[in-house]
Interface confidence: low
């Protein structure tokens, strides 16, 4: 293309670039529905921000396809290890695409707090977090999931939260 | 504003862009003070580089507003659950505003790593990663603290670290 | 430089901007070679991917040189503690470069996850993450080593993996 | 520049334990490993093991396993090896060498330690 | 372990002589090879690693080539200071080991 074109699309470039994009979701007392649905997020309030991507129903949307470093930490903990809970944590990211009903998983980890309590009695907390690259189309969602739930603490946004940015 | 104004701004942005901001900074003998206050890091020697960041006194100092991700990790460890040690470790990441006088928390983990060693005299190993986007304004600064700092290990900067980029 | 040598260097940042560097590799059966070489990694298939970097034999190869954010997580797990483990898991990135033979560590991270069973029979699950800022000049290779690899827990390249993207 | 000083020659009788140092100079020890090889009289050469200066992680050679046992201190950056339940097929010349992981680019003048009733 | 063989095991050869050593190994390696130089009473020298990568300070005469299972290492025009034993080493698989020498001696 011509200097016209390269101009056009350079200066489209630099008012994009301004809002390469970018967000930081984070916990609240409603994000854990305790439905087997995805977590919940704040996305306004505090440290929670939305640029260039939006929210629907505890999945970032991506508005503008490309290659996005993706990223969730969740505080776990408890008191001893319950009968019934899970032995095994699971913490991921996974991806809904219109084109697709099944959700995909990208990033996942397996954690086993509880065996860090020696007895019953015993608080202990542990953390999960998960980065990575993954491209992502317009109209794609990105939810973060946690089984068993339960064990997820929340508190103020700081220790449980979701983000991502366009690299 | 027309072509001549867009054309100085996209010089700019250009020139700018060389200097994305970024920062690695690295753990060092004096990392750990002892004094309740942050951490201490190295900002030259090795692996550690400031780039459109500034440092002082244990905080990455930001001199161009925008949104940036940020990123600690520590390495933890210790020979059983001494006496008097917290068996909850907190690592996170806050942040100083010339504006009001209280820190404010960004990023924060729990952990009960001593949890891990059966025995008082075994040794443990954890490490604690964190990392995610916040918005900083000029003249802010972010601090990484740890609570009980007795429990990090430090050897030469690769395992424990501060860091942060522009999104 | 005038304006034409700014033009063209503007349009050469458009260009190489729409490939800024960035990778993404997964675990898959042949990463866990038994070498006590680095792990190797799925760099096609599924969530996997090359943009401006390059690979070989377990490395990923800067071709452009800058401020790359790396990243490796791996999923560790077991049945107990077996005998002849190491009871400490060493999980690091390290830089091969062309001018000097030996690795240097950039990010490391150690865990003693066996200590979290309790019982010789339990089966348990960790998880390692690093992340941070490194510089890399063309030609350098970042490679991942975890000791002891035989605790590494592959699946489908969502648990394990290994990415950079310049920041 | 990189140095790797050694401790000094060693006699000893079958069954004792010979411990060698290696202080090294030069260099950030900790980022790097040490490797310690030995080579019998008109023999080649051969791999003990290796110990990352850092982490403490060690890798030992199974021949090895169970008599030898790395260690560093890295404070003086020195590492050690020590071989136990010697024989006298364990005279040799004892080398430590920076690195391990990929090759042992600078190497000890080497310590001559004969066993012998 | 992987094993490694070096031909010829004793070589004689006169001043400004080509010189070819050969190292095979018992399993793939890709190129984690390297070859040192031993003199008598002397600790190893690294003169090449990842097969061909000459190690900064070894003269331009040595070059190495090879992957996966057979290696050289070449000496363009031998001198005076090059008669010494030869090593090669594999570094892909722990145990490290080590091909059993090629002594190079004066014709």
């Known amino acids: 293309d011509g200097p016209a074109g390269s101009w056009e699309q350079l200066i489209q470039e630099r008012r994009s670039h301004e809002v390469n994009p970018a967000a930081h979701l984070t916990g609240a007392n409603s994000s854990l529905t305790g439905s087997g649905g995805p977590l919940l997020w704040e996305t306004q309030l505090g440290l929670a921000f939305l640029r260039g991507l939006s929210y629907h129903d505890g999945a970032l949307v991506v508005t503008k396809a490309g290659y996005y470093y993706i990223y969730s930490k969740v505080q776990l903990g408890g008191v001893g290890c319950p009968l019934g809970l899970a032995s095994t944590i699971t913490h991921g990211l996974y991806k809904r695409t219109p084109r697709y009903p099944e959700e995909l998983e990208l990033l996942v980890s397996q954690q086993s707090p509880c065996g860090r309590a020696t007895s019953s009695s015993r608080v202990w907390w542990d953390s999960s977090f998960l980065g990575g690259v993954v491209h992502l189309e317009a109209g794609e969602k990105v939810v973060v999931r946690v089984l068993d739930e339960r064990l997820v603490r929340l508190r103020d946004g700081t220790r449980s939260y979701f983000g991502a940015f366009m690299v | 504003d027309g072509p001549a104004g867009s054309w100085e701004q996209l010089i700019q942005e250009r020139r700018s862009h060389e200097v994305n901001p970024a920062a690695h900074l690295t753990g060092a003998n004096s990392s750990l003070t002892g004094s309740g206050g942050p951490l201490l890091w190295e900002t030259q020697l090795g692996l550690a580089f400031l780039r459109g960041l500034s440092y002082h006194d244990g905080a990455l100092v930001v001199t161009k507003a925008g949104y940036y991700y940020i990123y600690s990790k520590v390495q933890l460890g210790g020979v059983g659950c001494p006496l008097g040690l917290a068996s909850t470790i907190t690592h996170g990441l806050y942040k100083r505003t010339p504006r009001y006088p209280e820190e404010l928390e960004l990023l924060v983990s729990q952990q009960s790593p001593c949890g891990r060693a059966t025995s008082s005299s075994r040794v443990w190993w954890d490490s604690s990663f964190l990392g995610g986007v916040v918005h900083l304004e000029a003249g802010e600064k972010v601090v990484v603290r740890v609570l009980d700092e007795r429990l990090v290990r430090l050897r030469d900067g690769t395992r424990s670290y501060f860091g942060a980029f522009m999104v | 430089d005038g304006p034409a040598g700014s033009w063209e260097q503007l349009i050469q940042e458009r260009r190489s901007h729409e490939v800024n560097p960035a990778a993404h590799l997964t675990g898959a059966n042949s990463s866990l070679t038994g070498s006590g070489g680095p792990l190797l990694w799925e760099t096609q298939l599924g969530l996997a991917f090359l943009r401006g970097l390059s690979y070989h034999d377990g490395a990923l190869v800067v071709t452009k040189a800058g401020y790359y954010y790396i990243y490796s997580k791996v999923q560790l797990g077991g049945v107990g503690c077996p005998l002849g483990l190491a009871s400490t898991i060493t999980h690091g990135l390290y830089k091969r470069t062309p001018r000097y033979p030996e690795e240097l560590e950039l990010l490391v991270s150690q865990q003693s996850p066996c200590g979290r069973a309790t019982s010789s029979s339990r089966v348990w699950w960790d998880s390692s993450f690093l992340g941070g800022v490194v510089h890399l000049e063309a030609g350098e290779k970042v490679v991942v080593r975890v000791l002891d690899e035989r605790l590494v827990r592959l699946r489908d390249g969502t648990r394990s993996y290994f990415g950079a993207f310049m920041v | 520049q990189v140095q790797l000083v050694q401790s000094g020659a060693e006699v000893q009788k079958p069954g004792a334990s010979v411990m060698v140092s290696c202080k090294a100079s030069g260099y950030t020890f900790t980022y790097y490993g040490i490797s310690w090889v030995r080579q019998a009289p008109g023999q080649g050469l051969e791999w003990m093991g290796w110990?990352?200066?850092?982490?403490?992680?060690?890798n030992y050679a199974q021949k090895f396993q169970g008599r030898v046992t790395m260690t560093t201190d890295t404070s003086t950056n020195t590492a050690y090896m020590e071989l136990r339940s010697l024989r006298t097929d364990d005279t040799a010349v004892y080398y430590c060498?920076?690195?391990?992981?990929?090759?042992?680019?600078?190497w000890g003048q080497g310590t001559l330690v004969t066993v012998s009733s | 372990d992987i094993q490694l063989t070096q031909s010829p095991s004793f070589l004689s050869a006169s001043v400004g002589d080509r010189v070819t050593i050969t190292c095979w190994a018992s399993q793939g390696i890709s190129s984690y090879l390297a070859w040192y130089q031993q003199k008598p009473g002397k600790a190893p020298n690294l003169l090449i690693y990842?097969?061909?990568t000459l190690q900064s300070g070894v003269p331009s005469r040595f070059s190495g080539s090879g992957s996966g299972t057979e290696f050289t290492l070449t000496i363009s025009s031998l001198q005076p200071e090059d008669f010494a034993t030869y090593y090669c080493q594999q570094l892909k698989i722990y145990p490290l080991t080590f091909g059993g020498g090629t002594k190079v001696e004066i014709k």
């Open positions: 060498a920076k690195g391990g992981v990929a090759v042992l680019e600078y």
């Open positions: 990842v097969a061909s």
């Open positions: 110990i990352s200066a850092n982490s403490g992680n060690t």
